[in-house]
Interface confidence: low
Amino acid sequence: SAPGEDEECGRVRDFVAKLANNTHQHVFDDLRGSVSLSWVGDSTGVILVLTTFHVPLVIMTFGQSKLYRSEDYGKNFKDITDLINNTFIRTEFGMAIGPENSGKVVLTAEVSGGSRGGRIFRSSDFAKNFVQTDLPFHPLTQMMYSPQNSDYLLALSTENGLWVSKNFGGKWEEIHKAVCLAKWGSDNTIFFTTYANGSCKADLGALELWRTSDLGKSFKTIGVKIYSFGLGGRFLFASVMADKDTTRRIHVSTDQGDTWSMAQLPSVGQEQFYSILAANDDMVFMHVDEPGDTGFGTIFTSDDRGIVYSKSLDRHLYTTTGGETDFTNVTSLRGVYITSVLSEDNSIQTMITFDQGGRWTHLRKPENSECDATAKNKNECSLHIHASYSISQKLNVPMAPLSEPNAVGIVIAHGSVGDAISVMVPDVYISDDGGYSWTKMLEGPHYYTILDSGGIIVAIEHSSRPINVIKFSTDEGQCWQTYTFTRDPIYFTGLASEPGARSMNISIWGFTESFLTSQWVSYTIDFKDILERNCEEKDYTIWLAHSTDPEDYEDGCILGYKEQFLRLRKSSVCQNGRDYVVTKQPSICLCSLEDFLCDFGYYRPENDSKCVEQPELKGHDLEFCLYGREEHLTTNGYRKIPGDKCQGGVNPVREVKDLKKKCTSNFLSPEKQNSKSN
């Protein structure tokens, strides 16, 4: 029987009346061309909605916008356009919301052609009031807040100037000219690239990387011959041009650019690219594009210094620079990532790793599903997940995979069951154990979201026709109730819930169309009365993450430790609540070969836990560059996985000797760096 329709599915009591009492409609008094929605702060209930409408005239485009504010999670909205003097807001800059709970908002206005600079509207009280400020420059990018101090803003101008404000946009100072890219680092540090000759494009590969730690009082050149740079976790990466040819290599720094090491990654040519897929304070997933227009590359995982890399996954799907990859961090379970590979026959298959890239496997076939037409063997196939690539190819996939850190183990995604991703209409699948096992949750494509830390899952069917029904589940997608939230169906445009999945409110956005009028409308449904009571101890059960063999003493050991979680019982219909904190009990495991990645010069054959020497490096001394000095590596092929906490057990030998030799291959050696002050 279809999911949610078997006899054991209990109905949630009186949910129609409860949801009816908690369904709030807001009809916006206009239909604007686009709607953008931003949450201001965490748990504040404040939402800003900007509707914009472009009126194309013969010579120019005239714009109008309206700004609405809610302070009750979208149940009611107030038109606050007058607070911004009815000014047209530029949607390409969006609404710049300050970090954490600063309550800061910056809106960038459209100004007439001949003006000296742009205009912004600033609020530091969760958009209750705005201050208009005229800028001494025309912004090219959205204002960027320092993560450490929301009063510090940076922006690039259309003239490629780097502008900084120390008082939340009240006064601005140009700290550098000829800037291509600027980013905040930690401790209010700004990293930026500059060009010397023509332009950013002309000087690509000849850019300089600069750093200022005092908001532009003094500067340090920390890199030359730069193609691009990026920040990930505690790592600073620079893509640097080689001296002799057009290839470039990744260099990495863990001290804000004071010293650099060349990453042991293949160099790339002009048409290729590097991409940081994911990074944390322990390690980095790096994609290195294959030569030629293949649409794939190789994933490498780093050591704890970001220098030595192991090949993690071949034929990783990643179309072009800035293109599409399906790489997804499953945030609901430690160590889990999902992505797609391009097979030799050009079909696309989904792979999953449970140990941070150590080993990749296919997704287990859901028990309640049959293999589709792509399967050669109708009894043996896998689940394949639709993500960014499928969406970019305009397949009938309304949403990418979804997981939330506080909804432990839950992953929801569109997929098909076969030997590869299918272009047929997908269904929605759910895993409640971080991707080990899957179940078909809903037939056909849907929008979905997680509320109350997993206590409720909400879904809306993806349809070209107007809709008026929402589905919800209180048991992690096993059983579904449907609720008609409006008599008059609406053309659905999106589901919105507060980031973090702690809320119990969901907003359904769309527009109504009748003969004469077209209006944006939102329905906010509060599920608080469905989950009538607060969860108690008895509502939770102990769950061992990554458990695959309960008989095994080491069951659940991933990255050197196992974790037991307190998880809500599927049968419990209660509120985790906004203050819910995931309860977990870690315990250290004995080391095994699974706790080690293959060291530089070694690789792991498929389905083998042993690391063997790369044939091309057999008999060679393993030497590599570290902080501009040549190092000699003595290894039997293993290095501990970054973040692995195992103790005892297997302990492979690994020793690094300083050869006291300078590396000629390191373009970012310290003596090439210089400092200057303003």
Partner: antibody, heavy 124, light 106 residues
Amino acid sequence: QVQLVQSGAEVKKPGSSVKVSCKASGGTFSSYAISWVRQAPGQGLEWMGGIIPSFGTASYAQKFQGRVTITADESTSTAYMELSSLRSEDTAVYYCARQGRKTGYYYYYGMDVWGQGTTVTVSS
Amino acid sequence: DIQMTQSPSTLSASVGDRVTITCRASQSISSWLAWYQQKPGKAPKLLIYKASSLESGVPSRFSGSGSGTEFTLTISSLQPDDFATYYCQQADGHITFGGGTKVEIK
């Protein structure tokens, strides 16, 4: 102006069933909840159950669970209440009432439109 | 189910009097309470919804207040047309009515 018109009075034998209809006219029917409320002679009001026609799923008071069935036919804008295994205590006036007032969404605004009532007498 | 207790069950008053009827819920029902007026042989009529919102067409002498478990219907100045039976009704979960308060002429 919405009106709810109920079927005529019924006299029934104990153990039998009765089905009362409630037809909406002059307004929308589907988006509202229709409740059934009864009132025994000289007694107070007692909610039996209700349905949102466009939704189709009925909700019943525990006391009547298993004995009452509430349905709705959107095409004729009619709601029905069937009570089985009648006993003399079921002698009462049965009302249908509309609840929910805002077009476009449901919200509990009380039962704002009532039918004229149908008298059901259970007697042997 | 939630029980609704209305008091008093009978109330004698004169025209012009200020009349107060109380309704207590066995557990919190937020503001999901309505008040009705019923005259003999007639269907009930909605007066107040959501504890304090006056139904359109209802005279302003009727007002409702309260939330959680304690609710009050007040008729500020009793008129001849107001002699009737009044019911409270909760809508948090299954619907239940109070036992009724009969307002009669003193």
